[in-house]
Interface confidence: medium
């Protein structure tokens, strides 16, 4: 229901209550003229009128409040309309980045291509806050997700797609860390941990790109 509809309903209710009030006032004067009208029922009617008057007052206040809220919302909507969304549809916004959790299962290289086609890169974890967010986001999934971390063989360092090295304080890569694979060793994240695996295997992936945080 829109605010304008709520406002109309309140106006209608206000009119009904005013009508009821007048009717009851009429009944009171009629009762006062009639000798058999008891003092008790007159008091009851007075009480009812007071209640109705109170309600009318409350409704008026409510209506005024809603009117102000409506104006504020319209103002906010105008401001929002002048800004574009920080992330494209289906992407998740967190901090400075947008994330897309793929539903297709591909090898690491193919996953990398898929992200590039979306003007993005595979997941890069820069901070513990990033790691916490990703772990939370995938905690209900059983499946592994490729991230943008790989190395040629065990004697090479772990590197992100942009060539920067993995900061050792962020996480420990588990699993096949000492294995050498012809296609290289790539890292995937599964629930609470990061694992090394043969890049040729298929897994889901997480794409990442900068969020659009500039106002138009």
């Amino acid at each position: 229901m829109q605010l304008s509809q709520v406002s109309d309903l309140l106006t209608q209710e206000q009119a009904n209550l005013t009508h009821q009030k007048k009717k009851l006032e009429g009944q009171i004067s009629a009762r006062q003229q009639a000798e058999e009208a008891s003092q008790e029922s007159e008091n009851e009617l007075k009480e009812m009128i007071e209640t109705l008057a109170r309600k009318l007052n409350e409704k008026s206040k409510e209506q005024m409040e809603l009117h102000h809220q409506n104006l504020n919302l319209q103002e906010t909507l105008k401001r929002v309309a002048n800004c574009s969304a920080p992330c494209p549809q289906d992407w998740i916004w967190h901090g400075e980045n947008c994330y897309l959790f793929s539903s297709g299962s591909f090898n690491w290289e193919k996953s990398q291509e898929k992200c590039l086609s979306l003007d993005a890169k595979l997941l890069k974890i820069n901070s513990t806050a990033d790691l916490d967010f990703i772990q939370q986001a995938i905690s209900y999934s059983s499946f592994p997700f490729w991230m943008g971390l790989s190395r040629r063989n065990p004697s090479y360092p772990w590197l992100w797609e942009d060539g920067s090295p993995l900061m050792p304080h962020l996480f420990r890569v588990r699993g096949a860390v000492s294995q050498t694979y012809p296609s290289g060793t790539c890292a995937y994240i599964q629930r609470g941990a990061v694992y090394a695996e043969n890049c040729i295997l298929a897994a889901f992936s997480i794409c990442q790109k900068k969020a659009n945080l500039r106002a138009q």
Partner: antibody, heavy 115, light 107 residues
Framework: QVQLQQSGAELVRPGASVKLSCKAL????????MHWVKQTPVHGLEWIGA????????AYIQKFKGKATLTADKSSSTAHMELSSLTSEDSAVYYC????????WGQGTSVTVSS | DIQMTQSSSYLSVSLGGRVTITCKAS??????LAWYQQKPGNAPRLLIS???SLETGVPSRFSGSGSGKDYTLSITGLQTEDVATYYC?????????FGGGTKLEIK
């Protein structure tokens, strides 16, 4: 309430294939992963793999790759597991179970491989 | 693969007594641990997830504890309906692995 109804017991010949089904009731089938577990007196409970009915994505344990194929039919809210090239080692009770973790289980399907 | 070891295959306990079932993982599993109860002829039933969270409808005499590699399922005030086999399972990383099970009997 949530229920997983599995197909009846199977007696199959060695080398044959069998397709087990698991019908999901009482929840949105595409929202939860469906997992399959094998139970034998010798090896106890063994996780076979899982399928996400929403995306069709599946994951298997290495041991069951080529042995088990997991599929999901969204229209009937039914998950299937096909076991191929059966041997006596495949004789077991197979359970389907909803994730996370395995909070609802089917009643189990007994598969006996015998000539 | 992460191996899950339940040190006792059988445990015999008196009615009303307290029992502790242990489970050890071959690597840290960050509390991604579940406990199941299975009675003969039935499917397993989830008792505890996340190492300590009791599932809805599970009696409060059951409790889970532990961290890192070592986890425990405790049952206080043992009742006849608790006679079953109990399994632990790690669900940090596939393949998800189960312990060998601990069969509980009444003395």
């Amino acid at each position: 309430q949530v229920q997983l109804q599995q197909s009846g017991a199977e007696l199959v010949r060695p080398g044959a294939s069998v397709k087990l089904s698991c019908k999901a009731l009482g929840y949105t089938f595409t929202d939860y992963e469906m997992h399959w577990v094998k139970q034998t007196p010798v090896h106890g409970l063994e996780w076979i793999g899982a399928i996400h009915p929403g995306s069709g994505g599946a994951a298997y344990i290495q041991k069951f790759k080529g042995k088990a194929t997991l599929t999901a039919d969204k229209s009937s809210s039914t998950a299937h597991m096909e076991l191929s090239s059966l041997t006596s080692e495949d004789s077991a009770v197979y359970y389907c179970t909803r994730w996370l973790p395995m909070d609802y289980w089917g009643q189990g399907t007994s598969v006996t491989v015998s000539s | 693969d992460i191996q899950m070891t339940q040190s006792s295959s059988y445990l015999s306990v008196s009615l009303g007594g307290r029992v502790t079932i242990t489970c050890k993982a071959s690597d840290h599993i960050n509390n991604w641990l579940a406990w199941y109860q299975q009675k003969p002829g039935n499917a397993p039933r989830l008792l505890i997830s996340g190492a300590t969270s009791l599932e809805t409808g599970v009696p409060s005499r059951f409790s889970g504890s532990g961290s890192g590699k070592d986890y425990t399922l405790s049952i206080t005030g043992l009742q006849t309906e608790d006679v079953a086999t109990y399994y632990c399972q790690q669900y940090l990383i596939t393949p998800y692995t189960f312990g060998g099970g601990t069969k509980l009997e009444i003395k």
